[in-house]
């Protein structure tokens, strides 16, 4: 039969009225030994039932020493079978035995739940000897008992290699509702339903949720754990926790924000990095989000420029990093730069525009009418051109890059020469005899090298060779470039 | 053993307000409710809300919204009854009881001795 | 609001004669978790209400049994088998089945 103890009467008590046998105690069960040594064998029993034996886990003795009368069956005698009690008490609870004389060495160990308990658990086992028998108490004390205290107790004895094992103890230990799911953190779309959840659990049982919304009860009548609250939807941001309550009282959750998902806030501190001729490196910082991660953005660029149409270029970009290089841009130009960035709900108005301007560019076309011819006298090659007609962006022409090729047989070499801006003709020494001298000429901006003209070639013929007849760039329209030897 | 012990009796002239308070000993404050009772001469009791004694969230039945409100002092472990712009009909017996929700319902286990305000011009 | 009728309104009973309050809602107290929140409270003289009995038939710690609680849906019944001199006072129904929580009038039991 199975006994139980308990604690002081409960507002409710899951056994409701008296029960046989039964206890719930806060501090110690009714068979719990006085911390005191010596002989005692009054209390060697359970004062809820006298011992017993049963047929179950018993050493049944061979022989006496005299070997004429069988022993009676080896068991522990029956005690308590459950006890429960609060959180934070203290418990102590006892298997007793009564052993013949004749056996030698006898130890008592405690298992919970299926395992041995070693080491720093308050463990006592006491011996009463008699004529024919010692009665052993084994004591087991729990301090300020937590929910992992719960579970059933044993004793175990070996004797003669046979195992003796207790009835289990089964201890309860009650509190406040534990939370095993609480609500989330959510971010939810204007209007849309979304559910929150909340678990608690004892002992004992049952547990009964409240859900709470900014610091108003949602549900008047508790619901039992677990709950789950459908929300219809939300306009504007909320706080929601839940209370769970059983027979030990109430505990509540934690208060968790649900956040409404808007659009984001612009981007700010758009900062100009790089500038070249045709592209413009930015960052930015980002807005807060609207509770949405950022999906990509949008770099907006205007041509400030009273000619221009005010059409605005679009380039769009990931959200991170937060950096864009924006190319195809026309050199020496003035932009208006603005970046919106989006997340699922749509697009954040446009940062700050900031003014950014590109730098020169180099000039988009090579010098005309270049043209080539031998002074041997001077044992030199004299170069002529026209001045290209450059656009504004280009910039300030600050010179000219004049490139000469020199080939003849099994050698070839390239020399580049630098003049200042306001020449329109150059002198380059003869580097090579009887070879071939291809000529090309680039304009030179701040911006950097235009194109190079088509190629003049010009012979060089062994020295005695005379020949003033130039060589020039064709006329526009015209074929390939002659060569006049 | 857990005690609830509220404030003396209150005489007040239409229109103040009165705070009126409920000590709690002997348990763990925090971890129950306080319900509120009104008990007029000759009248049924009637249940005015409850607050969490926690969370301070308070709940009340719709003929006490507006000029009531609960309150708590929790390191003093005491919940308090405040009614605003006090009428005639406000004098009554007020009681507070502790309060939870356990497995036969709500609990109401122990009352406090009650607190009787009078109203009167 | 649920309305909670108790009659009689006074009960006059000789200590040691049985005693019977009744106690109708006006709604089903049947909760939707299969729970009656039927409770009955005892005010005595001068005191403040002590709880007595819930779900319908359950005692409190230290309440006697010779109270005892039936009933089910609307209608609720408290008896007391051999009245004592300490149960005079005044026995309230409550109901904690619906929102707001309410209270019968109150059944005022004395000795003869």
């Known amino acids: 039969a199975i006994t139980e103890a308990r604690e002081e009467a409960k507002p409710y008590p899951l056994f409701p009225g008296p029960l046989p046998g039964s206890l719930q105690t806060d501090h110690t069960s009714l068979l719990s030994l006085p911390h005191t040594s010596g002989y005692q064998p009054a209390l060697m029993f359970s004062p809820t039932q006298p011992g017993r034996p049963y047929t179950g886990n018993v050493a049944i003795p061979r022989v006496t020493s005299a070997g004429s009368k069988l022993l009676p069956p080896l068991a522990f005698k029956h005690t308590v079978g459950h006890i429960i009690l609060s959180e934070h008490k203290d418990v102590k609870f006892n298997c007793s035995i009564s052993v013949p004389n004749i056996y030698q060495d006898t130890t008592i160990s405690w298992w919970k739940d299926g395992k041995e308990l070693l080491g720093a658990h308050h463990a006592i086992t006491q011996f009463y000897p008699d004529d024919e028998v010692t009665a052993i108490i084994a004591s087991f004390s729990i301090t300020s008992v937590q929910r992992s205290d719960n579970g059933s107790y044993i004793c175990k004895m070996k004797i003669n290699n046979e195992e003796i094992v207790s009835d289990p103890i089964y201890i309860e230990v009650q509190g406040l509702p534990h939370f095993t799911k609480q609500p989330e953190s959510m971010n939810v779309t204007r209007n849309t339903a979304f559910n929150l959840t909340c678990q608690a659990v004892g002992p004992p049982e049952p547990v009964n949720i409240f859900w709470v919304q900014n610091s108003s009860r949602v549900n008047e009548q508790p619901e039992k754990s677990p709950s789950v609250l459908t929300v219809p939807g939300l306009t504007e941001m909320a706080v929601f926790s839940c209370e769970a309550h059983n027979d030990k009282g109430l505990t509540v959750s934690k208060g968790v924000q649900i956040n409404i998902k808007a659009i984001p806030s612009p981007p700010t501190e758009v900062s100009i990095h790089n500038s070249t001729a045709h592209s413009i490196l930015i960052s930015w910082v980002p807005g807060f989000d609207g509770y949405s991660p950022f999906r990509n953005c949008s770099v907006q660029v205007k041509e400030v420029d009273p000619l221009s149409n005010g059409s605005v270029m679009i380039f769009n970009t990931s959200a991170s990093p937060h950096m864009y290089q924006i190319k195809q841009l026309q050199a020496l130009a003035n932009y208006s730069i603005g970046v919106s960035c989006m997340n699922e709900i749509g697009w954040s108005a446009v940062s700050p525009w900031i003014l950014a301007s590109t730098t020169e560019g180099a000039p988009s076309v090579a010098p005309l009418n270049v043209t080539v011819f031998l002074n041997e006298s001077r044992d030199n090659v004299d170069i002529r051109w026209m001045k290209p007609l450059t656009k504004r962006q280009a910039g300030e022409l600050v010179g000219y890059r004049i490139s000469h090729v020199w080939q003849s047989a099994g050698i070839s070499k390239e020399l580049l020469e630098e003049v200042g801006q306001n020449n329109s003709r150059a002198q380059i020494s003869v580097q090579v005899h009887n070879a071939t001298c291809t000529v090309r000429i680039a304009a030179v901006t701040k911006g950097g090298v235009g194109p190079f003209s088509d190629p003049v070639k010009i012979f060089i013929p062994a020295h005695g060779w005379v020949d003033h007849a130039p060589s020039s760039t064709p006329a526009p329209g015209n074929a390939d470039p002659v060569l006049i030897i | 053993q857990i005690q609830l012990v509220q404030s003396g009796p209150e005489l007040k002239k239409p229109g103040e307000t009165v705070k009126i308070s409920c000590k709690a000993s002997?348990?763990?404050?925090?971890?129950?409710?306080m319900s509120w009772v009104k008990q007029a001469p000759g009248k049924n009791l009637k249940w005015m809300g409850w607050?969490?004694?926690?969370?301070?969230?308070?709940t009340y039945a719709d003929d006490f919204k507006g000029r009531f409100a609960f309150s708590l002092e929790t390191s003093a472990t005491t919940a308090y009854l405040q009614i605003n712009n006090l009428t005639n009909e406000d004098s009554a017996t007020y009681f507070c009881?502790?309060?939870?929700?356990?497995?036969?319902?709500?609990?109401?286990?122990?009352w406090g001795q009650g607190t009787t305000l009078t109203v009167s011009s | 609001d649920v309305v909670m009728t108790q009659t009689p309104l006074t009960l006059s009973v000789t200590i040691g004669q049985p005693a019977s309050i009744s106690c109708k809602s006006s709604q089903s107290l049947l909760d939707s978790d299969g729970k009656t929140y039927l409770n009955w409270l005892l005010q005595r003289p001068g005191q403040s209400p002590k709880r007595l009995m819930y779900?319908?038939?359950k005692l409190d710690s230290g309440v006697p049994d010779r109270f005892t609680g039936s009933g089910s849906g609307t209608d609720f019944t408290l008896k007391i088998s051999r009245v004592e001199a300490e149960d005079l006072g005044v026995y309230y129904c409550?109901?904690?089945?619906?929102?707001?929580?309410?209270f019968g009038g109150g059944t005022k039991l004395e000795i003869k």
């Open positions: 409550w109901q904690g089945t619906h929102f707001p929580r309410t």
């Open positions: 779900l319908v038939s």
């Open positions: 009881a502790r309060d939870y929700y356990g497995s036969g319902g709500w609990v109401f286990d122990y």
């Open positions: 002997g348990n763990t404050f925090t971890t129950y409710g």
């Open positions: 607050i969490n004694n926690y969370s301070g969230v308070s």
